[in-house]
């Protein structure tokens, strides 16, 4: 048993039918010794007498908020959650496997640049009576600060039957310097609460490998004088790292036929031009990858030809 | 990715182009022995992210965009003394900083093409023959050294009397790969930079 | 005290249908995942299927993928596997089997898959 | 196709001391915990060893589990000729969990 918070207690169960559970003992906080009684939520139930209460905590059941009063009055709470180790592996009820990049990805994250700022989220089906709380640094052993806000509610979406809700946060590494080579990774450490089921979720990542710049901006169409061809230009997004120079992208410029089935024109450059034919009805659009470490793609930025 | 590769103007920043040949290899490099090594641990997740030049060289200092110099902490001043004439320099007029800077990707360079030369070494004499490294990379990082034209003393190959351990060598060259191509990287905007102003 | 108990098997030809049940007791059933796992005669144990307890999961070994569906009634204390378009080599004796580092098993039940 | 791998056959005179190994990767064995089963013949697997060196109450100290890097082993001494049977391993794969690996199963003879 751990204390997550002020009052607050975790129980870790190995969690299998007929597992004898973990004995807990409860102290009740006052100076008082003699007529205190026990007693779990919502129940005028008592269980025990005296200032500690020892509980066999097998199930959700025997988890809670126990309260030890004393004529009437309460002196203290003691809230137990549980954390379900399931043949050796902690559970992973409440988020969703995003499966992306890979299998059991439970938490995303990306950066826009390398400034130490990133976005990480997390998806779920649970409506009500859970709360999030975030932890970062840098690295693990000898960690440096990483400050992370609250979790928020961010988008809901609905999947088949279900509600998906979609939660995120941002967090600040708090002293970055763009142009560093990351040797330590940045691990993220999400606590879960479902009613009285407690999980938690890490995440371990470098910042150059999470870059997802944001589109170009201002993206134009120049026509060139008896051509069918266009001058595309376009600018460095205004949340990427400076210098350019520096900081450079590379982009990639496609003309898109009304029909997905249209066979896609791609070409790809450095600057921040690009000569294309614009077909009838077609758009272009232009994304953007660090030129020198090959993180994600940004979104497009589209415009239409005609 | 297979990009169109640019070819670079011919009043280019001289290094711009080999910097650019050092990624490239680099990280086909990686890329093959990630696959070759399948079984060994060699992805970014798995190994220990060590530096080789920590301590002797200071290349992310020394070559800071000036944007960034107002940054504090990009300012971790380590200082490291450094040979100043190299024909990168040739017909700009270049501080004391870039000088320091372009010595320090030279000794960099140096102290990986010493390292992967006693690597090979060693997998040449493995009776799996499973890896060995890649003689275009070597090749570039020469180049790489001639253009930045540095007078430096010659670092003898380390050569060791024991019998290699195959499993660990494969172990550290992918710790190498890892680290050199972020110090690659670095090298690429540096250049880039240093083109552009 | 834990038991599980298979039913439902027998002989089927190919392309047809089979359900299987699982019954449990003396444990709450509905606080733990269950799987399915399958033994070809003479051959080795091999995964099948995984639910979660409440039903929100369930994941398929990929040999009875789209064929397989696993469910459970948490209220009836029964775990269930359907099985459609059966194929020759889906014969085996079929475990039902609790999750968690003790676990338990039913005593199996043979379905054989044969024109 | 099993990705954990045993030895088809162990054979051992009664007392003797036999050991089966399971062989996986980095993914599975090397990231999660080992059981063993042991199946007499015509009955459901029977778990010998949990958390890989745990014996859950009931099954005798002869029976003992490791693990080391990638690979696991079960050991029994003073070998029984209730022994007979076949034994197999059992991990996760840490991308594909809670799918069940098993190993390709051992049969222990008892000379």
């Known amino acids: 048993i751990w204390e997550l918070k002020k009052d607050v207690y975790v129980v870790e169960l190995d969690w299998y039918p007929d597992a004898p559970g973990e004995m807990v003992v409860l102290t009740c906080d006052t100076p008082e010794e003699d007529g205190i009684t026990w007693t779990l939520d919502q129940s005028s139930e008592v269980l025990g007498s005296g200032k500690t209460l020892t509980i066999q905590v097998k199930e959700f059941g025997d988890a809670g908020q126990y309260t030890c009063h004393k004529g009437g009055e309460v002196l203290s709470h003691s809230l137990l959650l549980l954390h379900k180790k399931e043949d050796g592996i902690w559970s992973t009820d409440i988020l969703k496997d995003q499966k992306e990049p890979k299998n059991k990805t439970f938490l995303r994250c990306e950066a826009k640049n390398y400034s130490g700022r990133f976005t990480c989220w997390w998806l779920t089906t649970i409506s009500t009576d859970l709360t999030f709380s975030v932890k970062s640094s840098r690295g693990s052993s000898d960690p440096q600060g990483v400050t992370c806000g609250a979790a928020t509610l961010s988008a809901e979406r609905v999947r088949g039957d279900n509600k998906e809700y979609e939660y995120s946060v941002e967090c600040q590494e708090d002293s970055a310097c763009p142009a560093a080579e990351e040797s330590l990774p940045i691990e993220v450490m999400v606590d879960a609460v479902h009613k009285l089921k407690y999980e938690n979720y890490t995440s371990s990542f470098f910042i150059r490998d999470i870059i997802k710049p944001d589109p170009p901006k201002n993206l134009q169409l120049k026509p060139l004088k008896n051509s069918r061809q266009v001058e595309v230009s376009w600018e460095y997004p205004d949340t990427w790292s400076t210098p350019h120079s520096y900081f450079s992208l590379t982009f990639c410029v496609q003309v898109q036929g009304k029909s997905k089935r249209e066979k896609k024109d791609r070409v790809f450059t450095d600057k921040t031009s690009a000569t294309v034919i614009c077909r009838k009805n077609a758009s272009i659009s232009v994304r953007a990858q660090d030129r020198y470490y090959s993180s994600s793609w940004s979104e497009w930025a589209s415009v239409p030809c005609s | 990715r297979n990009l169109p590769v640019a070819t670079p103007d011919p009043g280019m920043f001289p290094c711009l182009h080999h910097s650019q040949n050092l990624l490239r290899a680099v990280s086909n490099m990686l890329q093959k022995a990630r696959q070759t090594l399948e079984f060994y641990p060699c992805t970014s997740e798995e190994i220990d992210h060590e530096d080789i030049t920590k301590d002797k060289t200071s290349t992310v200092e020394a070559c800071l965009p000036l944007e960034l110099t107002k940054n504090e902490s990009c300012l971790n001043s380590r200082e490291t003394s450094f040979i100043t004439n190299g024909s990168c320099l040739a017909s700009r007029k270049t501080s004391f900083m870039m000088a320091l800077c372009l010595s320090s990707i030279y000794e960099d360079l140096k102290m990986y093409q010493v390292e992967f030369k006693t690597m090979n070494a060693k997998l040449l004499m493995d009776p799996k023959r499973q890896i060995f490294l890649d003689q275009n990379m070597l090749a570039v990082i020469d180049e790489l050294m001639q253009a930045l034209n540095f007078n430096s003393e010659t670092v003898p190959q380390k050569s060791s009397l024991e019998e290699p351990d195959f499993y660990k060598t494969k172990i550290k060259l992918c710790i190498l790969l890892h680290a050199f191509r972020i110090r690659a990287v670095t090298i690429d905007r540096v250049m880039s930079y240093l083109n552009a102003s | 005290q834990v038991q599980l108990v298979e039913s439902g098997g027998g002989v089927v030809q190919p392309g047809r249908s089979l359900r299987l049940s699982c019954a449990a007791s003396?444990?709450?059933?509905?606080?733990?995942?269950m799987h399915w796992v399958r033994q070809a005669p003479g051959k080795g144990l091999e995964w099948v299927a995984f639910?979660?307890?409440?039903?929100?999961?369930?994941y398929y070994a990929d040999s009875v993928k789209g064929r397989f569906t696993i469910s459970r009634d948490n209220s009836k204390n029964t775990l269930y596997l359907q099985m459609n378009s059966l194929r020759a080599e889906d014969t085996a004796v079929y475990y039902c089997?609790?999750?968690?580092?003790?676990?338990?098993w039913g005593q199996g039940t043979m379905v054989t898959v044969s024109s | 196709q099993s990705v954990l791998t045993q030895p088809p056959s162990v054979s051992g005179a009664p007392g003797q001391r036999v050991t089966i190994s399971c062989s996986g990767s980095?993914?599975?064995?090397?990231?999660?915990?080992v059981k063993w089963y042991q199946q007499l013949p015509g009955t459901a697997p029977k778990l010998l060893i949990y958390?890989?060196?745990q014996r859950p109450s009931g099954v005798p100290d002869r029976f003992s589990g490791s693990k080391s890097g990638t690979s696991a082993s079960l050991a029994i001494t003073g070998l029984q000729a209730e022994d007979e049977a076949d034994y197999y391993c059992?991990?996760?794969?840490?991308?594909?969990?809670?799918?069940?690996?098993f190993g390709t199963g051992t049969k222990v003879t008892v000379l």
């Open positions: 089997k609790t999750h968690g580092s003790h676990d338990n």
């Open positions: 003396g444990f709450t059933f509905s606080s733990y995942g």
């Open positions: 639910i979660r307890y409440d039903g929100s999961n369930k």
């Open positions: 980095r993914s599975n064995i090397g990231s999660n915990t």
């Open positions: 958390y890989n060196d």
């Open positions: 059992q991990s996760y794969d840490r991308y594909t969990h809670p799918a069940l690996l």
